[in-house]
């Protein structure tokens, strides 16, 4: 099951917030609301799944209240009238503390997870497909609202002439390169739904979309370094990012970062001064534990060209260099759609970027 066509996240939205849920609610849609309960003002906040922006029709009103020892109210509002409340007399949120709130839409109910534990099940009182808006209000600060929609949809592949399990063609390289042999990674259950080729012809960093044609190859102008671009829709299982370039002859280090807001979800850092390929995650300016193990020798060579293919899967990123699988990096930041920025810097010259 692949995530195809997931909606881009709302990043650091101001509260009160109302935003469209593209395509409405669907069975299997997972919506993550990440934020912090304000410690100072107010005793309530609410997340609403509603029809339109008026607030008169709310299919699911999720309303933590820091009152009477703390409890959570769940309810439905139809034509301006509230139904009977369902109360959960345990408060999983704490004032002043961050939270990770995940809503899973299923055919019979909403399932709500708070901080990694299933918190409540709310059976639908009205058809959920009417919902097209999410709103958040009250004593809360939001980091992001992200969307993941697990479904297999037959769409026209971006690589329409190249099955995904076949070699990916990069621009020509000065030295004999090995393409990815068939079967290095299994074919994905859903094809890539959108490909963006980044080129620097008239405008540095310009990008355009080729949703239904094979990736085009371009001349090799120098990309501006550091190179920063948006990953439209963020990461999701089956998403690929392709880069090629040349390591400078005197290179010490370079990096490829996949970023989520201020966090670096994936830091790929070849270090020629240490003969290592370091992988890590930075959350709130704090680095986690490094991963350095490799199945073979350092694949990057000073003065030589390279290609990097990053394939996002549900559990991990798979990274291939010069067509050969190199390592897996298990997600430390799991809200994949929020990982929506690519940053490349250091001692290389980029020749091709495809997100």
């Amino acid at each position: 099951m692949a995530f195809s066509g997931s909606q881009a996240p709302y990043l650091s939205p101001a509260v009160p917030f109302s935003g469209t849920i593209q395509g409405g609610l669907q069975d299997g849609l997972q919506i993550t609301v990440n934020g912090t309960v304000l410690s100072s003002s107010g005793t309530r906040f609410a997340v609403n799944f509603q029809t339109g922006f008026s607030g008169n029709d709310i299919a699911f009103h999720f309303n933590p209240r820091f009152e009477d020892g703390g409890y959570v109210v769940c309810n439905t509002r139809q034509n301006g009238s509230w139904g009977p409340e369902e109360r959960k007399t345990h408060m999983p949120f704490q004032k002043g503390m961050p939270f990770d709130l995940c809503f899973l839409v299923q055919s019979s109910d909403f399932k709500v997870m708070v901080n990694g534990i299933l918190f409540v099940q709310y059976f639908h009182r009205v058809p959920f497909h009417r919902v097209d808006t999410i709103s958040v209000n009250g004593s809360v600060q939001l980091s992001y609202i992200s969307f993941q929609n697990p479904r297999t949809v037959p769409v026209q592949p971006a690589f329409s002439t190249v099955p995904f399990s076949q070699p990916v063609c990069f621009p020509p390289r000065p030295r004999g390169r090995r393409q990815k042999p068939p079967g290095v990674w299994p074919a994905n259950p859903a094809p890539i739904t959108q490909t963006v080729i980044h080129t620097v012809q008239s405008a540095p960093g310009q990008m355009f979309s080729t949703p239904a044609i094979p990736p085009m190859m371009y001349p090799h102008p120098a990309y501006p370094m550091p190179f920063i671009t948006t990953i439209l829709g963020g990461l999701y299982p089956s998403k690929s990012i392709l880069l090629s370039g040349t390591v400078l002859p005197s290179a010490q280090r370079f990096h490829i970062n996949l970023c989520s807001g201020n966090h670096i979800a994936f830091h790929l850092n070849p270090r020629f001064d240490e003969n290592a390929v370091v992988r890590n995650t930075q959350i709130d300016n704090s680095w986690g534990s490094e991963e350095r193990s490799l199945p073979r020798k350092m694949p990057f060579v000073r003065g030589q060209s390279f290609s990097v293919w990053i394939l996002c899967e549900a559990h991990c990123l798979k990274v291939a260099v010069d067509g050969q699988h190199l390592f897996e990096y298990y997600h430390r930041l799991r809200n994949l759609p929020t990982i929506n920025r690519l940053e490349v810097g250091g001692d290389i010259q980029l020749t091709h970027v495809q997100t």
Epitope: F3, V114, Q121, T281, R332
Partner: antibody
Framework: EVQLVESGGGLVQPGGSLRLSCAAS????????IHWVRQAPGKGLEWVAY????????SYADSVKGRFTISADTSKNTAYLQMNSLRAEDTAVYYC?????????????????WGQGTLVTVSS | DIQMTQSPSSLSASVGDRVTITCRAS??????VAWYQQKPGKAPKLLIY???SLYSGVPSRFSGSRSGTDFTLTISSLQPEDFATYYC???????????FGQGTKVEIK
């Protein structure tokens, strides 16, 4: 390969303290919930506490609330259980476990990886 | 707290037998129930998660089902390596977000 390794168990007198460690490899504790589960000799499994470092959230069983503190050091990829005011009834093998919540487009409500356990004996 | 009442506490069976173990939750826990197998001196192993999903690498003779607040673990044809203690566990947020059943010891008849 995912692995959890507990350490820090041993013999302690009633009222004493111990700090258990749970070193993780193959995944990161920052994006998982880590639980401590104990098993008294010849008895069943008892949930003790959990931490969800991603949002700094934790929770405790009533039997240990106020005495035990769970924490995590994401830079060391390690979770800890600080046990104070220990009692004889806290004697048990203590396991740490990863509670995986989302995998392959499915919710996984279960503890998919466990450590080997570390024995804590509270006796005078 | 949500209680998980597991039955029977022990049972004797022969190789090839069909074995059923039941857990009843004291209130709705949705599908947030897992089943574990534990052998003496070893850590528990996950068999079934989300009430009915078979965990990776677990033989298909193990299955889980749910009917309301009743959860069942079935071993369709008991094998010699299946003699062990089995636990159910719920993870539905309450004052104690995780609780285990008392365990069922499956012994050789």
């Amino acid at each position: 390969e995912v692995q959890l390794v507990e350490s820090g168990g041993g013999l302690v007198q009633p009222g004493g303290s111990l700090r258990l460690s749970c070193a993780a490899s193959g995944f990161t504790v920052s994006s998982s919930s880590i639980h401590w589960v104990r098993q008294a000799p010849g008895k069943g499994l008892e949930w003790v506490a959990y931490i969800y470092p991603y949002s700094s959230s934790s929770s405790y069983a009533d039997s240990v609330k106020g005495r035990f503190t769970i924490s995590a050091d994401t830079s060391k990829n390690t979770a800890y259980l600080q046990m104070n005011s220990l009692r004889a009834e806290d004697t048990a093998v203590y396991y740490c476990a990863r509670y995986s919540t989302y995998s392959s487009s499915k919710w996984v409500w279960g503890m998919d990886y466990w450590g080997q356990g570390t024995l804590v004996t509270v006796s005078s | 707290d949500i209680q998980m009442t597991q039955s029977p506490s022990s049972l004797s069976a022969s190789v090839g037998d069909r074995v059923t173990i039941t857990c009843r939750a004291s209130q709705s826990v949705s599908s947030a129930v897992a089943w574990y197998q534990q052998k003496p001196g070893k850590a528990p192993k996950l068999l079934i998660y989300s009430a009915s999903s078979l965990y990776s690498g677990v033989p298909s003779r193990f299955s889980g089902s749910r009917s309301g607040t009743d959860f069942t673990l079935t071993i369709s044809s008991l094998q010699p390596e299946d003699f062990a203690t089995y636990y159910c566990q719920q993870s539905y947020y309450d004052s104690n977000p995780i609780t285990f059943g008392q365990g069922t010891k499956v012994e050789i008849k």
